[in-house]
Interface confidence: low
């Protein structure tokens, strides 16, 4: 299976209804900390606007957050780990009427509310410690 | 296959400290997440309090405060501390281990059979 490079970026075009799946794996164990980051911008700019802001810190914690005017805003955290060490998972972001949805091989975990319309997002970053082998968004 | 025994229940009074073991046996105990759950009389299970293999701890809000958990990987033990004790803290109290850091009850890969709780006002 053939790895994707990362930082992958690419442009898209979002709605309700749309899906973004991502296939992966971290690329060290968890007592190393690996990271992974997803970010919806507003533009096809790293430094632009961010609708949705995803960063998994593995075998700890998840962190969501938007970032309007080049302004982190307030940061949502959860708890929940579904990610298991060394192994590869399937990360589904459902884009619903009033939220993201963040799938984990197939079960729902995390929501974040909507702050930036869903329309205005232009590209997304798949980046930090993992292998990436899928990248896809249906709508 | 990891066994899991509680031992610590009883009935206590209103105000008072309880601290529940479990001690487990089997597999490698230091490499799994350990959580409590609770289930009251007709209440569905819920999520007290969690323990990562490396060593976070996290307990739910309706505890947050008056809750402490621990583990002895030596003597393979998790310990949940709980103090200043309610009457709505009576329920059965179950130990359990999974793979995976998540505080749902599907997720877990193993259980106890629970110790009953019993805080008397």
């Known amino acids: 299976m053939s790895l994707l490079s990362v930082p992958h970026t690419e442009s898209v075009s979002l709605s309700t209804g749309s899906t973004v799946t991502i296939e992966a794996r971290p690329l060290v164990c968890f007592f190393n900390e690996p990271h992974l980051q997803v970010d919806f911008h507003t533009e096809m700019k790293e430094d632009s606007d961010i609708a949705f802001h995803f960063q998994v810190y593995f075998g700890n914690r998840v962190v969501m957050n938007s970032r309007e005017y080049r302004t982190w805003k307030e940061e949502v955290e959860s708890k929940n780990m579904p990610f298991q060490d060394g192994q590869e998972f399937e990360l589904r972001i459902l884009v619903l009427e009033d939220k993201y949805q963040v799938m984990v091989n197939g079960q729902a975990y995390y929501n974040f509310n909507h702050r930036i319309p869903v329309s205005s997002v232009k590209m997304v970053q798949v980046w930090r410690d993992i292998s990436l082998t899928k990248f896809n968004v249906s709508n | 296959q990891l066994q899991l025994v509680e031992s610590g229940g009883g009935l206590v009074q209103a105000g008072d400290s309880l601290r529940l073991s479990c001690a487990a046996s089997?597999?490698?105990?230091?490499?799994?997440?350990m959580m409590w759950f609770r289930q009251a009389p007709g209440k569905e299970r819920e999520f007290v309090a969690a323990l990562a293999w490396r060593g976070g701890t996290y307990c739910a809000n309706s505890v947050k405060g008056r809750c402490t958990i621990s583990r002895d990987n030596a003597q393979d033990t998790v310990y949940l501390q709980m103090n200043s004790l309610k009457p709505e803290d009576t329920a059965v109290y179950f130990c359990a281990a999974s793979r995976r850091y998540v505080f749902d009850p599907s997720a877990m890969d193993y259980w106890a059979k629970g110790t009953l709780v019993t805080v008397s006002s």
């Open positions: 089997g597999r490698t105990f230091s490499s799994y997440h």
